[in-house]
């Protein structure tokens, strides 16, 4: 699987999940988020050669087509597969508010 366990431990040029830390205050200007200060959002990148974690028959065919026709622009894209939520804490006035934000952390990628 093209997940963090594999991708973060290997120098993989092809489609894989890559580490990306986002600081809420410095990177996004969200000064009001109290905790966490930031988090590993991660992202997917890298080429999708034939049979590389193909998501659908279409992406398999597209990957084969691109392998056999390297000059063609059509090829599968490396995109998130599994995402996890992130819990944040902020204050409304002096009242703490905890929210779970869905699909915030990329855990694995696929070619689609």
């Amino acid at each position: 699987a093209l997940d963090t366990n594999y991708c973060f431990r290997n120098l993989e040029e092809n489609c894989c999940v890559r580490p990306l830390y986002i600081d809420f205050r410095q990177d996004l200007g969200w000064k009001w988020v109290h905790e966490p200060k930031g988090y590993y959002a991660n992202f997917c990148s890298g080429p999708c050669p034939y049979l590389r974690s193909a998501d659908t028959t279409h992406s398999t065919v597209l990957g084969l087509y691109n392998t056999l026709n390297p000059e063609a622009s059509a090829s599968p894209c490396c995109v998130p597969q599994d995402l996890e939520p992130l819990t944040i804490l902020y204050y409304v006035g002096r009242t703490p508010k905890v929210e779970q934000l869905s699909n915030m952390v990329v855990k694995s990628c696929k070619c689609s």
Epitope: W32, Y90, Y91, V92, G93, R94
Partner: antibody, heavy 121, light 111 residues
Framework: EVQLVQSGAEVKKPGASVKVSCKTS????????MNWVRQAPGAGLDWMGQ????????NYNEMFEGRVTLTADTSTSTAYMELSSLRAGDIAVYYC??????????????WGQGTLVTVSS | DIVMTQTPPSLSVSPRETASISCRAS??????????MHWYLQKPGQSPQLLIY???NLESGVSDRFSGSGSGTDFTLRISRVEANDTGVYYC?????????FGQGTKLELK
């Protein structure tokens, strides 16, 4: 230049709902909280609630008894305020106003031009 | 809810004089070393505009004839050398507690 442009005046019957839009430009919509404030004729300002457009978090003033729903469309940088079960006491100018950016509840540094909602049978 | 009481309700000032508006909160609006109190002016037929942020910080583009002071529960907005363009209704606002609340307004007129 930061701009908040609201939809036009509305006339509604008692018991109906109204939905006011606030189209923004000149800043990153998903970076700031958007507040809604109402002002009855000749009266002061009442905070209705707020929304964080990036993922739709909302905080409401209990004064509005769950009649207010705030939404946002990030693709068009537009915020919406819907008020249901309208009554005569809801006749007011409704403003959208951008939060200053340091806190969730905050001062408001840019305001829309206001939308007059009239309730009449 | 925190109740904001402004005095006076209305004020008539001669040009070039100084006007003072008071705002008293029903409980302290101070937290974490800040006073969560702000001031707005609503000119006739217009939307409110932010003048003073966090009790004493002048908002960008606002004349330095406006100044704010105070802490805890008692705050003051001062307008020096009053001009015709300063007429309108002034509001204080707190955001230390949910819900955010405004004062009832002070109407400033020129003599």
């Amino acid at each position: 230049e930061v701009q908040l442009v609201q939809s036009g005046a509305e006339v509604k019957k008692p018991g109906a709902s109204v939905k006011v839009s606030c189209k923004t430009s000149g800043y990153i919509f998903m970076k700031y909280w958007m507040n809604w404030v109402r002002q009855a004729p000749g009266a002061g300002l009442d905070w209705m609630g707020q929304i964080f457009p990036a993922w739709g978090s909302t905080n409401y003033n209990e004064m509005f008894e769950g009649r207010v729903t705030l939404t946002a469309d990030t693709s068009t940088s537009t915020a919406y305020m819907e008020l249901s079960s309208l009554r005569a006491g809801d006749i007011a100018v409704y403003y959208c106003a951008r939060g200053y950016g340091n806190y969730a509840l905050d001062a408001m540094d840019y305001w829309g031009q206001g939308t007059l909602v009239t309730v009449s049978s | 809810d925190i109740v904001m009481t402004q005095t006076p309700p209305s004020l008539s000032v001669s040009p070039r004089e100084t006007a003072s508006i008071s705002c008293r909160a029903s409980e302290s609006v101070d937290s974490y070393g800040n006073s969560f109190m702000h001031w707005y002016l609503q000119k006739p037929g217009q939307s409110p505009q932010l003048l003073i942020y966090l009790a004493s910080n002048l908002e960008s583009g606002v004349s330095d004839r406006f100044s704010g002071s105070g802490s805890g529960t008692d705050f003051t907005l001062r307008i020096s050398r009053v001009e015709a363009n300063d007429t309108g209704v002034y509001y204080c606002q707190q955001n230390n507690e949910d819900p955010l609340t405004f004062g009832q307004g002070t109407k400033l007129e020129l003599k």
